[in-house]
Interface confidence: low
């Protein structure tokens, strides 16, 4: 027979929630493990088990779905916390089983505390606006499935600590914040307050997220090379060191992979036999465009190394381009004592 | 103080049946896996049977079709029936706690009850 | 069935020894190990669980290594009340069982 599929502990699942909010918590097992859903498990007679390991504790245990109000209850495969409480942090197992089969899986769970202005350890959502690009919206996230369609909330909106209110370029509008032209200045965190009533009790959902207004699209260009140029030559005598930076710029272009490499004589530094070093920098401007300098670099130089081509290549979503070092071996200056010496030799 | 005491040992002939009751105090057995281990006079550990706190049991193969665990979490007492027994099945029964729902290691042990199988 | 092998299975020493015993698992049970102690006459004690966390109230000296298929129960200093009989024992899930197997045990006696 076979043992438990343990997928164990799911890290990339770090599941944070706010102290004293509902928290509804899928079992991973369907959503990135198994291939069937849990209706078709629980059709074929399997089980879904619940239970936990405390913070700093190792005791497994199992969940206590007696508590007043149903403060934790479970619904097919969504653990129910109605609302959370700090010590509820710990690292969760859900397990499917029969007398057959059997697959389980842990996540954790981190119960938050937030202050008056929604500072907390939480890792936030990142949220990209085009820079002056016309209206944008976000949405407030992870609200689905709290409370039935027939179920009205009401949705309060906050830039930092301050409620939106007759914001010049920012208005709310029910689960969506609308920017009519969005600027450097509207970098920030936004919070919204979601209040709903269920069985005589009022609960919050408090969600942040962070925005961040970058390039348009409008005004990106395929990516520019700075270095090389045709205004720098590297000239060099054989035995010193060659350095020729490629220095490239990349507007902003979502989810586009921004990449720079050299060619020596048409092939990459790896599949050849020269002994040469790169070093990669990036840095980033306001609106998230990209430079990447990448150093080429040959320790001691030789004659051969100097009538190599040296070209840098890029790459992003708008485009490909290269551009090729001007590279040449110094010239030695004429040695005249030595010239004069034998002008006069022998008269 | 948490205590597990077995109880319903005693010498029995081959082929007849027994059943063990460990009561336990001190915990509500619902929330813990619980398991039987014997020792044969002499020899080392064996794992008979567990059962977790949702009421799954899990038989050593040997023991299939023979023991059968069981537990009544309302008398906080666990449970072997042990049926057709046989001269090797004379040993100290142990019951134990899991250390959780359905870890597999023991943590909490009784002191024993002694099953002897003889004509 | 996975088999639990542990050797040696007896072995003598002072007090004040480093003492190693090793367990090993017929097939792969990843860090699903336990290691109990057992003097005569008592009920066996857990000291190690998970391969290498020592279970509540068991002194430093004591300390659990390994994964997969074989492991390694260390006492770094032997003390008197050490003299005992050492079990591993499989922790590992299976639809047929939680736990099972122990080893056959290592009887740690005074040289």
């Known amino acids: 027979s076979e043992r438990c599929d343990d997928w164990g502990l799911d890290t990339m699942r770090q599941i944070q929630v706010f102290e004293d909010e509902p928290a509804r918590i899928k079992c991973p097992l369907f959503e990135h493990f198994l291939k069937f859903n849990y209706s078709t498990a629980h059709s074929a007679g399997l089980t879904l088990i619940w239970y936990w390991t405390r913070q700093d504790r190792d005791l497994e245990e199992p969940i206590n779905f007696r508590l007043p109000e149903n403060r934790i209850s479970k619904e097919k495969d969504v653990l129910w916390f109605r609302p959370t409480l700090l010590n509820d942090t710990g690292n969760y197992t859900c397990m499917l089983r029969n007398t057959t089969y059997c697959s389980k899986v842990a996540f954790p769970l981190e119960v938050v505390q937030k202050d008056s202005c929604f500072n907390s350890p939480m890792k936030l959502p990142v949220h990209k606006l085009y820079i002056e690009y016309g209206i944008q919206r976000i949405t407030c996230p992870n609200v689905d499935g709290y409370f039935p369609s027939s179920v009205k909330p009401t949705i309060t909106w906050y830039m930092g600590c301050y409620k939106i209110q007759n914001f010049n370029n920012v208005i709310p509008e029910g689960m969506n914040l609308s920017f009519l032209i969005a600027l450097i200045s509207n970098n920030g965190n936004y919070t919204c307050v979601v209040t709903y009533p269920e069985n005589g009790r009022t609960f919050h959902l408090t969600r942040t997220l962070t925005v961040k207004v970058v390039g348009s699209p409008k005004n990106a260009v395929p990516p520019v090379i700075h270095s090389p140029n045709d205004h720098v030559v590297y000239e060099k005598e054989p035995g010193e060191e060659l350095l020729i930076p490629c220095t490239v710029y990349f507007s902003f272009l979502m989810d586009s992979r921004n990449e720079v490499w050299w060619t020596i004589d048409g092939k990459k530094p790896d599949d050849i036999t020269i002994d040469v070093t790169i070093n990669e920098s990036i840095s980033h401007s306001r609106t998230e465009d990209e430079t990447r300098t990448q150093i080429l670099s040959i320790k001691k130089v030789t004659s051969e190394d100097l009538k190599r081509s040296y070209v840098c290549h890029a790459r992003s979503a708008k485009g490909e381009v290269a551009k090729a070092a001007k590279v040449k071996q110094k010239v030695p200056a004429p040695r005249y004592t030595v010239e004069l010496a034998c002008g006069f030799g022998a008269t | 103080e948490v205590q597990l005491e077995e109880s319903g040992g005693r010498v029995v002939q081959p082929g007849r049946s027994l059943r063990l009751s460990c009561a336990v105090s001190?915990?509500?057995?619902?929330?813990?896996?619980m398991g039987w281990v014997r020792q044969a006079p002499g020899k080392g550990l064996e794992y008979v049977a567990v059962?977790?706190?949702?009421?799954?049991?899990y038989d050593a193969s040997w023991a299939k079709g023979r023991f059968t665990i069981s537990r009544d979490n309302s008398k906080n007492t666990l449970y072997l029936q042990m049926n057709s027994l046989r001269a090797e099945d004379t040993a100290v029964y142990f019951c134990?706690?899991?250390?959780?729902?359905?870890?597999?290691?023991?943590?909490?042990w009784g002191q024993g009850t002694l099953v002897t199988v003889s004509s | 069935d996975i088999v639990m092998t542990q050797s040696p299975s007896s072995l003598s020493a002072s007090v004040g020894d480093r003492v190693t015993i090793t367990c090993q698992a017929s097939e792969n049970i990843g860090n699903g190990l336990a290691w109990y102690q057992q003097k005569p006459g008592q009920a066996p004690k857990l000291l190690i669980y998970g391969a290498s966390t020592l279970a509540s109230g068991v002194p430093s000296r004591f300390s659990g290594s390994g994964s997969g298929t074989d492991f390694t129960l260390t006492i770094s200093s032997l003390q008197p009340e050490d003299f005992a009989t050492y079990y591993c024992?499989?922790?590992?899930?299976?639809?047929?069982?939680?736990?099972?197997?122990f080893g056959g045990g290592t009887k740690v006696v005074i040289k």
């Open positions: 134990a706690r899991d250390r959780g729902t359905s870890t597999g290691s023991l943590d909490l």
């Open positions: 001190g915990i509500d057995l619902d929330n813990y896996a």
């Open positions: 024992q499989c922790t590992y899930w299976n639809p047929d069982y939680i736990g099972g197997a």
């Open positions: 059962i977790s706190s949702d009421g799954f049991f």
